[in-house]
Interface confidence: medium
């Protein structure tokens, strides 16, 4: 027969055939052969596999440091990776939560809606057309652009959510 | 590098005054908000102040509104905390911190004890 040129779901192609991939929580030790299946071995304690593989080495745990302000959330098991969260009261840096800080900021672009209390984070949000941040900042809402018409200016430059708006004088030459 | 160093702790009788300082160096001081953080006797950190980079804003926690003034000098790339009217719960090892509060950046902080 023919050699495949592709597998079954949770196979892989090796040396012109197809073998198992081995199960979450177990590394490949040994690819299959014509008359033997592939051999897979379970992750050591400290370890995970969370994908059908054919891994050679499990992944590491990820380890929640105390000296970052981290704690596990949920232990790792053989097919899943440890869950970081951050000590009470302090908040994580990013989804992934590889750091702590005591109240986020809000991003250029961005005001705080609510300032962090000891229980949440802080919240930001966008600023909407007619409204700027230009800094980073745990606290500032975002500022509406300038009025250059209440300072009988024109507006020279527009503004973003970034950035204000840049006023100037009025042209005089008018016919 | 980033340095941060508190000074102007001390015993302080309640209902008396103190003035914190905190010399910075290492980043440029005017693009960044600064604030106080606090810690108590076996608590945890308590965000007390903030002031933006322009210095005309200025945060402050409940606990300490209209006792406390958090204040910046550009010229000496300092920060401030006025403190009156001081009480027993207000002792605690004072702190400085640029922007993003990181849990694993502290200086050593300045220690307010307010006891009779």
């Known amino acids: 027969p023919e050699p495949p040129t592709a597998c079954r779901e949770k196979q892989y192609l090796i040396n012109s055939q197809c073998c198992s991939l081995c199960q979450p929580g177990q590394k490949l030790v040994s690819d299959c052969t014509e008359f033997t299946e592939t051999e897979c071995l379970p992750c050591g304690e400290s370890e995970f596999l969370d994908t059908w593989n054919r891994e050679t080495h499990c992944h590491q745990h990820k380890y929640c440091d105390p000296n970052l302000g981290l704690r596990v959330q949920q232990k790792g098991t053989s097919e899943t990776d440890t869950i970081c969260t951050c000590e009470e009261g302090w908040h994580c840096t990013s989804e992934a939560c590889e750091s702590c800080v005591l109240h986020r900021s809000c991003s250029p672009g961005f005001g705080v809606k609510q300032i962090a209390t000891g229980v949440s984070d802080t919240i930001c949000e966008p600023c909407p057309v007619g409204f700027f941040s230009n800094v980073s900042s745990a606290f500032e809402k975002c500022h509406p652009w300038t009025s250059c018409e209440t300072k009988d200016l024109v507006v020279q430059q527009a503004g973003t959510n970034k950035t204000d708006v840049v006023c100037g004088p009025q042209d005089r030459l008018r016919a | 590098e980033v340095q941060l160093l508190e000074s102007g702790g001390g015993l302080v009788q309640p209902g008396g005054s103190l003035r914190l300082s905190c010399a910075a160096s290492g980043f440029t001081f005017g693009w960044y908000e600064m604030q106080w953080v606090r810690r108590a006797p076996g608590k945890g950190l308590e965000w007390v102040s903030a002031?933006?980079?322009?210095?005309?804003?200025?945060y402050y926690a409940d606990s300490v509104k209209g006792r406390f003034t958090i204040s910046r000098d550009w010229s000496k790339n300092t920060l401030y905390l006025q403190m009156n009217s001081l009480r027993a719960e207000d002792t605690a090892v004072y702190y400085c911190a640029k922007e993003l509060l990181y849990f694993d950046y502290w200086g050593r902080g300045t220690l307010v004890t307010v006891s009779s």
């Open positions: 002031i933006s980079g322009d210095g005309y804003r200025t």
